[in-house]
């Protein structure tokens, strides 16, 4: 038959960040490749890497289409040199993904301090927003966007000469701070959804950035 | 269900030193922040310190700066505070707390307290 | 730091009485200021967080409000289990602080 000793795939797993989807699977193949589909709970399966021999498959375009849906995938194994045939009524061999909902799922990815600017002693802190492949009206939506107040972002800053991180919020990506003239701090941020329960809650810190060099700027 | 519970109060002289532990279960501490707040016989709350043990960034209040230290132990889902060169006013119930990391970031839950005396 | 002035530091009142507590910040605080209540022998309840949003499972006869760096919790009709400690805190600046509570007894 036209799909005997093709393995079915397993272990499917999503791999997310700001949106960027991809599905990933095993086993490697041998004499044998994948086609992937993908549909919401109410609509219809659409194929996606036809016939690959890879074992992941960028699925991005598809969940941004709604990222407040709920996506189910599944791997279908052909034998390698596998072509479409109308004749063909046997199913081949597939394993269904874990149900993904891009919007409470996705991993925040690792921010970045965008500018900081010193006003006597107050300190403007400016959090880069990361532009998503997310849509709307043919308009790429950033991270910002999508979530809305949703997304927090939490400034630790210090004094160069000290080890205690103080602690600022915003749900925007503006910071305003208090600080003492004549000092020099360092920052960094985190990105946090505190609505979710899960290890997606928090983003890793972004790259430490401190006063007296370039992204900075100092006036009385 | 969410819980904290502290452990490792009792009697100690003054000078001496002390660790609580701050179990948690029911969620992973490596996700929110956790903070130590005291209350001393017959008086209000005070902040002693925080953790955040997705980094280990730590502050503490100035009353505490220098002798007590908070760490984590994500495998063990545990905060501790490490108190040295304790003092008669450092007798109090301490308690752990978590911080949800929201905007206002409300301690939404706390331990039952331990209690930590220092007398001679 | 940020200095958070409660009052009354006490008060008496009956079941049924309307109770008002106040908070001043020593400075700008936005809305990020929590109330809790605190029965003898029991850690903290949190009962109110960003000024005036009721946390779960609390009775919607508590509310909280603000006015510029003045925030105000309300016990609409005084029950039985509500005489209590409650304390205010701030959580816009490190550190957190307190307000020095105000106990609520019964009359």
């Known amino acids: 038959s036209g799909t005997t000793n093709t393995v079915a795939a397993y272990n499917l797993t999503w791999k997310s960040t700001n949106f960027k989807t991809i599905l990933e699977w095993e086993p490697k193949p041998i004499n044998q490749v994948y086609t992937v589909q993908i549909s919401t709970k109410s609509g219809d399966w659409k194929s996606k890497c036809f016939y690959t021999a890879d074992t992941e498959c960028d699925l991005t375009d598809e969940i941004v289409k709604d990222v407040k849906q709920t996506y189910l995938a599944r791997v279908f194994s052909y034998p390698a040199g596998h072509v479409e045939s109308t004749g063909s009524t046997e199913e081949p061999p597939y394993e269904n993904s874990p149900e993904f909902t891009p919007y409470l799922e996705t991993n925040l990815g690792q921010p970045t301090i965008q500018s900081f600017e010193q006003v006597g002693t107050k300190v403007n802190v400016t959090v880069q927003d990361e532009w998503t492949l997310v849509r709307r009206n043919d308009t790429f939506l950033s991270l910002r966007d999508v979530f809305g107040k949703d997304l927090i972002y939490t400034l630790y800053y210090w004094k160069s000469s000290s080890s205690g991180k103080k602690t600022a919020k915003t749900n925007t990506n503006e910071f305003l701070i208090d600080v003492d003239k004549g000092e020099n701090y360092c920052f960094s941020v985190q990105a946090v959804i505190p609505s979710r329960r899960t290890a997606n809650r928090k983003s890793t810190d972004s790259p430490v950035e401190c006063m007296g060099h370039e992204k900075g700027e100092s006036r009385e | 269900e969410v819980q904290l519970v502290e452990s490792g109060g009792g009697l100690v002289q003054p000078g001496g030193s002390l660790r609580l532990s701050c179990a948690a279960s029911?969620?992973?501490?490596?996700?929110?922040?956790i903070h130590w707040v005291r209350q001393a016989p017959g008086k209000g709350l005070e902040w002693v310190g925080y953790?955040?043990?997705?980094?280990?960034?730590?502050y503490y209040a100035d009353s505490v700066k220098g002798r007590f230290t908070i760490s984590a132990d994500t495998s063990k889902n545990t905060a501790y505070l490490q108190m040295n060169s304790l003092r008669a006013e450092d007798t109090a119930v301490y308690y752990c707390?978590?911080?949800?990391?929201?905007?206002?970031?409300?301690?939404?839950?706390w331990g039952q307290g331990t209690l930590v005396t220092v007398s001679s | 730091d940020i200095q958070m002035t409660q009052s009354p530091s006490s008060l008496s009142a009956s079941v049924g009485d309307r109770v008002t507590i106040t908070c001043r910040a020593s400075?700008?605080?936005?809305?990020?200021v929590a109330w809790y209540q605190q029965k003898p022998g029991k850690a903290p309840k949190l009962l109110i967080y960003?000024?005036?949003f009721l946390y779960s499972g609390v009775p919607s006869r508590f509310s909280g409000s603000r006015s510029g760096t003045d925030f105000t919790l309300t016990i609409s009709s005084l029950q039985p289990e509500d005489f209590a400690t409650y304390y205010c805190?701030?959580?816009?600046?490190?550190?957190?602080?307190f307000g020095q509570g105000t106990k609520v007894e019964i009359k």
């Open positions: 400075q700008d605080v936005n809305t990020a």
């Open positions: 953790i955040d043990p997705s980094n280990g960034y730590t």
């Open positions: 707390a978590r911080d949800d990391q929201s905007l206002s970031s409300p301690f939404d839950y």
């Open positions: 029911g969620f992973t501490i490596a996700y929110y922040i």
């Open positions: 805190q701030q959580h816009y600046t490190t550190p957190p602080t």
């Open positions: 960003s000024a005036s």
